[in-house]
């Protein structure tokens, strides 16, 4: 084996494991990984007497190198004394030496958390004549700490006698207060509370916050619609900047990802509004998998006239998930509007609030412009709800009297969609051959007296259909009963509406 100098490690006990009445204590020095023999270990004990013992070297099995330990036992006033272990290895070089200086025992310590708190403004958002900054130095293992206040990096002449320290359990906290004039605070200087502890400096800084956004200009970043995400599988997010004053200099919208991975190519659109302002949008295609796995996307807006960049970020909504319940209804015929009907769809109790609503007729999706859907609103519980409204014409329902309301939502299983069909005339199902065979179970109004079915939407249920007890396999809500068909024969007529 070739010549190898040793690594040297101090060996100490934990302070809390040494009895307070101990009259002597032993510490050590480990020299390991050296070749060839020997090493020479000496101790500097200052003014204290001590006895040393160097153990015979042992061979490290795998490398063939050596290790040895030297022990020092001291008595008397050892508690605050520092000791130096000096290891020499002449085979490495005649002057090869490593010194380790340490105390008898090691204290494991928790460093402080430093936080500056600021006195609040008055009710109108104005600063009072003086501003108080409070430096909280918390959660550290008791020991000497020094607090210094800095203004723009320069030490301030502050009376620190007001600093107070408290101890809770094994940890201590200290606080120091700094009072500033309003003029100093508004001058945009940075104030730093600097804490020195165990040979390290911990700090927190603060200054008067700039206005949270440049006045007048707003930026918004949308999440992808569930339809684009789960059905089209080509999700996009859009960064929208509004109320820009048309001026020289370009508005820059820059996309980035929190993971640092590259972003796709974005498309940009500028529109001049009637009020003279400029609206800029940038649309970025995102990876379906990246989005679902929780990637964060950032849009950064810069412009020569903005005092600072606007930053917006978006990511998949966190929190609990709940699939939507979908209910579709047709309004009764209204006098004077025989050739038009309104269909309504209530979608409720879903979480999170991102949802896409579509209407289908003849298995074809109707254009979004045909229907109007509210923004998600909170229910009294923890979920959200929307209403969607669709106007249909007689020509449509005579062609096929079945319209489908479909909700696309991440919590809906198995395919992120839930849908319900609705007919304008549920009892006269469109005159097609299908009308002879409808489902053998339909919903009843809750609390309906058994055997007395009730007409809904102006049509008449079959006399032999009655409201039976709720069925576990019926997909509707539990408070609704089931209409059970009692007809006999090969092709019985069934009631397809509400009882």
């Amino acid at each position: 084996a070739s010549t190898q100098s040793p690594s040297v490690f101090p060996l100490t006990r934990c302070c809390k494991n040494i009895p307070s009445n101990a009259t002597s204590v032993t510490l050590g020095c480990l020299a390991t990984g050296y070749f060839p023999e020997p090493v020479m270990v000496t101790w500097d004990t200052g003014s204290l007497n001590g006895t040393t013992m160097t153990l015979p070297a042992t061979t490290l099995t795998l490398s063939g190198h050596y290790a040895t330990i030297s022990l020092l036992t001291v008595s008397g006033a050892w508690a605050k004394q520092m000791f130096t272990c000096r290891v020499a290895h002449t085979p490495s070089s005649t002057d090869w030496v490593d010194n380790k200086t340490f105390s008898v025992c090691s204290r494991d310590f928790t460093p402080p958390t430093v936080k500056i708190l600021q006195s609040s403004c008055d009710g109108g958002g104005h600063f009072p004549p003086t501003i108080q900054l409070l430096c909280l130095v918390s959660g550290y293992t008791p020991g000497t700490i020094n607090i210094t206040w800095l203004e723009d990096g320069q030490v301030m002449d502050v009376d620190l006698s007001t600093a107070s320290t408290t101890q809770e359990g094994e940890l201590a906290s200290t606080q120091s207060e700094l009072t500033l004039s309003q003029k100093h605070w508004l001058s945009d200087r940075t104030y730093t509370c600097q804490v020195t502890y165990q040979g390290h400096t911990f700090e927190d800084s603060t200054k008067k916050c700039a206005d949270s956004n440049p006045r007048g200009v707003s930026a918004y970043l949308s999440r992808p619609s569930p339809f684009d995400l789960f059905i089209r599988k080509s999700p996009t997010i859009t960064c929208l900047v509004v109320d820009l004053a048309p001026s020289k200099g370009t508005v820059n919208l820059t996309w980035s990802r929190a993971s640092g991975k590259p972003v796709n190519h974005s498309t940009r659109k500028e529109e001049k509004q009637r009020n003279g302002t400029l609206t800029v949008t940038s649309t970025l295609p995102v990876g379906t998998r990246d989005w679902i796995e929780g990637e964060t996307y950032q849009c950064r807006v810069t412009h020569p006239h903005l005092p600072r960049a606007l930053m917006r970020s978006t990511t998949k909504t966190s929190g609990p998930r709940a699939a939507p319940e979908v209910y579709a209804f047709a309004t009764p015929e209204w006098p004077g509007s025989r050739d038009k009907r309104t269909l309504a769809c209530l979608i409720q109790n879903f979480m999170p609030e991102d949802i896409s609503v579509q209407w289908l007729h003849n298995e074809v999706q109707l254009p979004d412009a045909r229907h109007s859907t509210t923004q998600p609103r909170k229910t009294k519980g923890s979920g959200f709800f929307v209403f969607s409204r669709l106007e249909v014409t007689r020509a449509e329902w005579e062609q096929k009297d079945e319209f489908i309301c479909r909700a696309v939502h991440e919590a809906a299983s198995p395919s992120q969609t839930v849908q319900r069909a609705v007919s304008v005339n549920p009892g006269l199902a469109g005159g097609s051959a299908q009308s002879q065979r409808a489902p053998d179970r339909v919903l009843c109004h809750s609390g309906q007296q058994q055997g007395l079915p009730r007409a809904a939407g102006g049509s008449v249920p079959h006399p032999r259909c009655h409201c039976g007890a709720g069925r576990a396999d019926w997909p509707g809500p539990p408070e609704l009963d089931v209409c059970v068909e009692e007809a006999e024969g090969e092709a019985p007529w069934t009631w397809t509406g509400l009882c």
């Epitope: 460093p111 430093v114 500056i116 911990f202 700090e203 927190d204 929190a258």
Partner: nanobody, 128 residues
Framework: DVQLQESGGGLVQAGGSLRLSCLAS???????????MGWFRQAPGKEREFVAG?????????AYAESVKGRFTISRDNAKNTVYLQMNSLKPEDTAVYYC??????????????????WGQGTQVTVS
Amino acid sequence: DVQLQESGGGLVQAGGSLRLSCLASGRTFTTTSGYNMGWFRQAPGKEREFVAGIKWVSGSNRAYAESVKGRFTISRDNAKNTVYLQMNSLKPEDTAVYYCAAATGQSYVPIREYEYVYWGQGTQVTVS
């Protein structure tokens, strides 16, 4: 996992300046997830030692080793997922390999090597 990539090291004369950068990336790394970032250094034949640390979320919470206080400044840019170490008034004893490291879960800025979980490969700084 978190990946850390240092850059900006090099040869500089005593009294000069250097700015080191550390780019953080990875599926679990987001600037809001409570990471603490630190710079350590290791000179030949010496142990790795703490230089400076910063909290991602606040950015104003920092810690420095006494030997670099007033000369080195740690900062971060959330948008770029990058931590910087600005080193001024460099001395020959600042010569070392400088490592970027990430820790998570502490309310304070950690200063001990064992508290940091993720490490970069290091960048050499030589002060002549």
